[in-house]
């Protein structure tokens, strides 16, 4: 299709080479197309003006994204050619930063229902650059935490070094929806609830004497509880002896509950004590079996191919640790009488 009629928007993504971050493009169809298309505002036939330029499908997923190759080749369907770019309804998610994401992205409805719809498209010209060293050293992170029940704020990473007074007007989105009240480089939250978690996007306009563009940053916000003040609990094994059959395989599970920590480095391991000797066992990787806002339960198993007489003399010790302290639970194997 002819993209010369598409409305055009220039965006700049300056990414930090020090951290992982994501980026999004919204299918910003011009009004009134956008309101009718992306937000399912179903109009009755009487309300539809004759000249409405676009009467697209109300299904949010009925948007097609393309990339325009710089060499003039035909448009490419994003879903077929770019595995690191994911389409979610009217939004395009870039999972990894890099200058190779620079280019022209076009979105339009899949269903063309009237002659007017042909021009119903947006061309977004995305420029991706590494962050300039002129930016301040302590710019806000693209991953920010809000402490539940307390006051907090979400900062726009590309503007976090500027004072509120000199900051340009900022447009904020949360999970793709416009936050029309917020206009500064920081969103202040009086009391943090779990619904404040989500993907926030901040946009502001930058220009030179010639043209202007939108500088965009994406912030992943999570709501968290305060760091635990407790060392981890071992939930299993509870007993310090375990009846086993000689010659049979055996799996002993160690399950531990770790309280939430912002910087979370849990340790869970098995070691064996035999007389005066003690050694760590290389066992399968630990896995998280339950994760909540407040804590995480992690499991790690020790596997014996077959229980031997020697194993009955040993103690199998599960050791768990967080930044507060450590806990151990030992298990002695006992032959089943039978």
């Amino acid at each position: 299709f002819n993209i010369s009629g598409c409305s055009t928007k220039k965006l700049l993504w300056t990414y930090s080479t020090r951290s992982e971050e994501e980026f999004v493009l919204f299918c910003d169809l011009p009004e009134p197309q956008k309101s009718h298309f992306c937000h399912r505002n179903r109009l009755s036939p009487k309300q539809v003006p004759e000249h409405l330029p676009f009467m697209g499908s109300n299904d949010l997923s009925d948007v097609q994204w393309y990339q325009q190759p710089s060499n003039g080749d035909p448009l490419e369907d994003i879903r077929k050619s770019y595995p690191h770019i994911i389409q979610d309804k009217c939004t395009l998610h870039f999972l990894t930063p890099g200058v190779n994401n620079s280019g022209s992205y076009i979105c339009r409805p899949k269903m063309i229902k009237s002659p007017y719809d042909v021009a119903c498209c947006v061309k977004m010209i995305l420029e991706v650059k590494p962050q300039t060293n002129a930016s301040c050293e302590y710019s806000a992170s693209h991953k920010q935490d809000l402490l539940l029940g307390s006051t907090g704020s979400i900062s726009c990473p590309s503007l976090s070094c500027q004072s509120d007074a000199q900051s340009p007007a900022v447009t904020w989105y949360k999970n793709g929806k416009l936050l029309s009240v917020e206009r500064s480089n920081r969103i202040v939250v009086d009391e943090v609830y779990d619904y404040h978690q989500g993907t926030y996007v901040c946009d502001y306009t930058q220009s030179d004497t010639v043209s202007s563009w939108t500088v965009r940053a994406v912030v992943q916000v999570r709501t968290i509880v305060g760091d635990t003040k407790l060392k981890p609990d071992i939930l299993d094994p509870v007993e310090d002896t375990l009846e086993v059959e000689l010659g049979k395989p055996l799996t002993i599970s160690c399950k531990a509950r770790f309280g939430f920590e912002r910087v979370f480095n849990p340790v869970i391991k098995w070691y064996i004590k035999d007389s005066d000797l003690e050694w760590e066992v290389s066992v399968p990787e630990a896995k998280s079996i339950k994760s909540t806002l407040k804590d995480e339960i992690i499991e790690r198993n020790i596997i014996l191919e077959k229980v031997t007489q020697r194993d009955l003399r040993r103690k199998f010790v599960c050791f768990v640790q967080n930044s507060i302290g450590n806990t151990t639970q030992s298990v002695q194997l006992k032959e089943k009488r039978g």
């Epitope: 220039k10 700049l12 300056t14 710089s70 010209i125 420029e127 650059k129 590494p130 962050q131 300039t132 060293n133 002129a134 930016s135 930058q206 030179d208 004497t209 010639v210 043209s211 563009w213 500088v215």
Partner: antibody, heavy 120, light 110 residues
Framework: SLEESGGDLVKPGASLTLTCKAS?????????MCWVRQAPGKGLEWIAC????????TYYANWAKGRFTISETSSTTVTLQMTNLTAADTATYFC??????????????WGPGTLVTVSS | AAVLTQTPSPVSAAVGGTVTISCQAS????????LAWYQQKPGQPPKLLIY???SLASGVPSRFKGSGSGTQFTLTISEVQCEDAATYYC??????????FGGGTEVVVK
């Protein structure tokens, strides 16, 4: 604004460093900083540019490679080191900012220039 | 090497007339449209008039018009004013981070 300094009268074979100071500008990695010169009564001649993304990446006109070195000494200062100067290097040297993004490339801001004269 | 050839020079025009300056590139500019036009008056640095072949820089009167693609470009000044007397340069940007300026065209207004 951009302001050049360091222009001088030097003898052939000498070296000279020019400095470009930026002030009151929006810093963005879409801009590169460049040097362009103009011999008296002649046209504009591009010398070199440096990315302003902190990477230190540079690009030069073929004739300038080796004798001219562009570098960023701070986030607001760019220098041009010139060695083994000859009379042909006599010119006004302009510092210019170029927008390099969205498939566009143009010099959108220029300094007033600084005069370098090479004569014995 | 990338070479930009400007013709003619000098060119004279009467006030209210039209001036056309041509810029021929020895190879296609980047994206076929990365050509800019600058105006320079004596003792001053150049001033951007046109970028990406045909886009008018802000603050530049609409009587300046750029056109062309690939290797052949034109700057047209219609309804020439006295203040348009200056030297005009084209500048091309090429793949591989190469810049080149044309030799310049002096416009004399009578």
């Amino acid at each position: 604004s951009l302001e050049e300094s360091g222009g001088d009268l030097v003898k052939p074979g000498a070296s000279l460093t020019l400095t470009c100071k930026a002030s009151g500008l929006d810093f963005s990695s879409v801009y590169d900083m460049c040097w362009v010169r103009q011999a008296p009564g002649k046209g504009l001649e591009w010398i070199a540019c440096i990315y302003s993304d902190g990477s230190g990446s540079t690009y030069y006109a073929n004739w300038a490679k080796g004798r001219f070195t562009i570098s960023e000494t701070s986030s607001t200062t760019v220098t041009l080191q010139m060695t083994n100067l000859t009379a042909a290097d006599t010119a006004t040297y302009f510092c210019a900012r170029v927008l390099n993004g969205w498939g566009e490339y143009y010099f959108n801001l220029w300094g007033p220039g600084t005069l370098v004269t090479v004569s014995s | 090497a990338a070479v930009l050839t400007q013709t003619p020079s000098p060119v004279s025009a009467a006030v209210g007339g039209t001036v056309t300056i041509s810029c021929q590139a020895s190879q296609s500019v980047y994206n076929n449209n990365n050509l800019a036009w600058y105006q320079q008056k004596p003792g001053q640095p150049p001033k951007l008039l046109i970028y990406t072949a045909s886009s008018l820089a802000s603050g530049v009167p609409s009587r300046f018009k750029g056109s062309g693609s690939g290797t052949q470009f034109t700057l047209t000044i219609s309804e020439v004013q006295c203040e348009d007397a200056a030297t005009y340069y084209c500048q091309g940007y090429y793949s591989g981070y190469i810049n080149a300026f044309g030799g310049g065209t002096e416009v004399v207004v009578k």
